[in-house]
């Protein structure tokens, strides 16, 4: 706490300028009027104040705004919002995507902090749901932002919002994210063509079931190894040799290198030998000829 | 521009564990498997495992099963080797090198890092 | 497992003169790789799919052969080529490399 000591004869401020860079900490607080300090909180950020001049500002913004400052005011924070904790951010209500741009503006290049995090939770919870221009502008600040979300939070996404979402967004994700979000995509997509469909919805493909692979399959598409090896394992298992031959197309060489790996490692597995040396790879591992294979799972279900 | 950033030299007592590091950057982490390499001073390469990052799934060598564990932090895009019950037969360079999925060779490799086991 | 046996296992060479290397295998395989390593630096990517020359690599490089026999051509030796050659084969588990060939300056 800053002691109250009155402001010496004519150090009052008329205006937040440069001048008071050199007034000391207890002269802020006793000469820079909190009223006017909200009005020209825009000035705040192109004078060079210490950090412990910008603590006094903001006890002064505190003192004015007990219940949370308003837009106005955070708008023009700047740098004074690195000194704000997730406490005061959840007094606010932001609902300008301005707002929000600006103040992911001063935290740019650095890990999504707690404070960041409150405040984008409070924009989000207070628009209802993540559409498509906050999803926008929170995936350019933090590409991870999608994958750092629970399925459930994920579930409020609109399809419309799924044409923001770049490939490197969906980096993290992980299989339980995509199982929500790739329904959305399919939807989202629907009325492209084939090869467009496909540069759009192969990032999403994690969350994709096996009719859906199956159908992708006719589709001449030339699936990459890297989007193969991001398929459920269950999604997988029941595509047949010739199946994975035509979703792969001219990549279907790489499941020689990936063949300890899964998906690709269980999927051999459940092949028959034969089936598997017609792609002339020497993929090994598949069921040897003359056995017969039991669908235990298919029996249970009619017992 | 790739990197593959390694941590430093570590010299450890025998009997001990040590941990590797190796940070990639400049494109997508999850294209790629993490392989990790040894060379002994004046000797040829050794391929000790991989790892994918998308679905933690490892392959090791035979011969390094139960020496080497492979780990990978997607969010940071970091890779990581733990050697376990180390002897001076561990004593060496290792190196962290990037593998295209579905490609049989190393596009870019870290820049080693020297594990001294000596009591 | 496949054994990849290199040689010569050193070799030396004047500069613009040709040189080439072997790289023999006991199996047939699909693809070799070629490494250079110099003194106190990591591998560096050659030749992929045996004859494919890696980004940045100059064409004075070349790769060819197949299935147990595989070579690795320098059309005119500079005085950077002074290195450590490794070919290295991705067919069958585990992954392997050869003993290298060292190539020096004359």
């Known amino acids: 706490e800053v002691e109250k000591t009155a402001c010496p004869s004519g150090k009052k401020a008329r205006e937040i300028d440069e001048s008071l860079i050199f007034y000391k900490k207890w002269e802020l607080e006793a000469c820079v009027d909190a009223a006017l300090l909200a009005t020209q909180m825009d000035r705040v950020n192109a004078i060079p104040f210490t950090y412990e001049q910008l603590d006094v500002l903001k006890h002064k913004l505190d003192e004015l705004y007990p219940q949370g400052y308003p837009e106005s005011v955070i708008q023009h924070l700047g740098y004074l919002f690195l000194k704000m904790s997730p406490e005061d951010i959840r007094k606010w209500n932001v609902t300008s995507l301005e707002t929000l741009k600006a103040l992911l503006e001063v935290n740019k290049g650095h890990e999504m902090s707690p404070q960041v995090a409150t405040l984008i939770d409070r924009f989000v919870k207070g628009r209802g749901q993540l559409d498509k221009d906050t999803l926008d502008t929170l995936t350019a600040f933090y590409p991870g932002y999608l994958c750092s979300l629970s399925p459930e939070e994920l579930s409020s996404v609109p399809p419309s919002s799924i044409w923001a979402v770049r490939p490197q967004d969906l980096d993290t994700c992980d299989p339980r994210q995509l199982d929500v979000l790739y329904p959305k995509a399919r939807l989202a997509f629907q009325n492209m063509n084939g090869s467009e469909y496909f540069v759009k919805i192969q990032s999403f493909l994690g969350g994709a079931p096996t009719e859906d692979l199956k159908a992708l399959s006719q589709q001449n598409v030339s699936m990459d190894l890297a989007t193969f090896m991001k398929l459920r394992t269950d999604a997988v298992l029941p595509l047949t040799v010739a199946e994975v031959q035509k979703l792969l197309g001219p990549h279907v060489e790489g499941l020689k290198a990936e063949e300890r790996h899964r998906p690709v490692r269980d999927w051999i597995l459940r092949q028959r030998q034969d089936d598997l040396d017609t792609l002339g790879l020497g993929l090994q591992g598949g069921i040897p000829n003359g056995y017969l294979v039991l669908d235990l799972s298919m029996q249970e279900a009619l017992s | 521009e790739v990197q593959l950033q390694q941590s430093g030299p570590e010299l450890v007592k025998p009997g001990t564990s040590v941990k590797i590091l190796c940070k990639a950057s400049?494109?997508?982490?999850?294209?790629?498997?993490m392989d990790w390499v040894k060379q002994r001073h004046g000797q040829s390469l050794e391929w000790i495992g991989d790892?994918?990052?998308?679905?933690?799934?490892?392959i090791y060598n035979q011969k390094f099963e139960g020496k080497a564990i492979l780990t990978v932090d997607k969010s940071s895009s970091t890779a990581y080797m733990e050697l376990r019950s180390l002897t001076s037969e561990d004593t060496a360079v290792y190196y962290c090198?990037?593998?295209?999925?579905?490609?049989?060779?190393?596009?870019?490799w870290g820049q080693g890092t020297t594990l001294t086991v000596s009591s | 497992q496949i054994v990849l046996t290199q040689s010569p296992a050193i070799m030396s060479a004047s500069p613009g003169e040709k040189v080439t290397m072997t790289c023999s295998v006991n199996?047939?395989?699909?693809?070799i790789y070629w490494y250079q390593q110099k003194p106190g630096s990591s591998p560096r990517l050659l030749i992929h799919?045996?004859?494919n020359l890696a980004s940045g690599v100059p064409v004075r490089f070349s790769g060819s052969g197949s299935g147990t026999s595989y070579s690795l051509t320098i059309s005119r030796m500079e005085a950077e080529d002074a290195a450590t050659y490794y070919c290295?084969?991705?067919?069958?588990?585990?992954?392997?490399f050869g003993g290298g060939t060292k190539l020096e300056i004359k």
């Open positions: 090198a990037r593998r295209k999925l579905g490609r049989g060779y190393f596009d870019y």
């Open positions: 400049g494109d997508t982490f999850t294209a790629y498997n």
């Open positions: 790892i994918n990052p998308n679905t933690d799934s490892t």
């Open positions: 199996l047939s395989v699909r693809y």
């Open positions: 799919d045996t004859s």
């Open positions: 290295q084969q991705w067919s069958s588990f585990p992954y392997t």
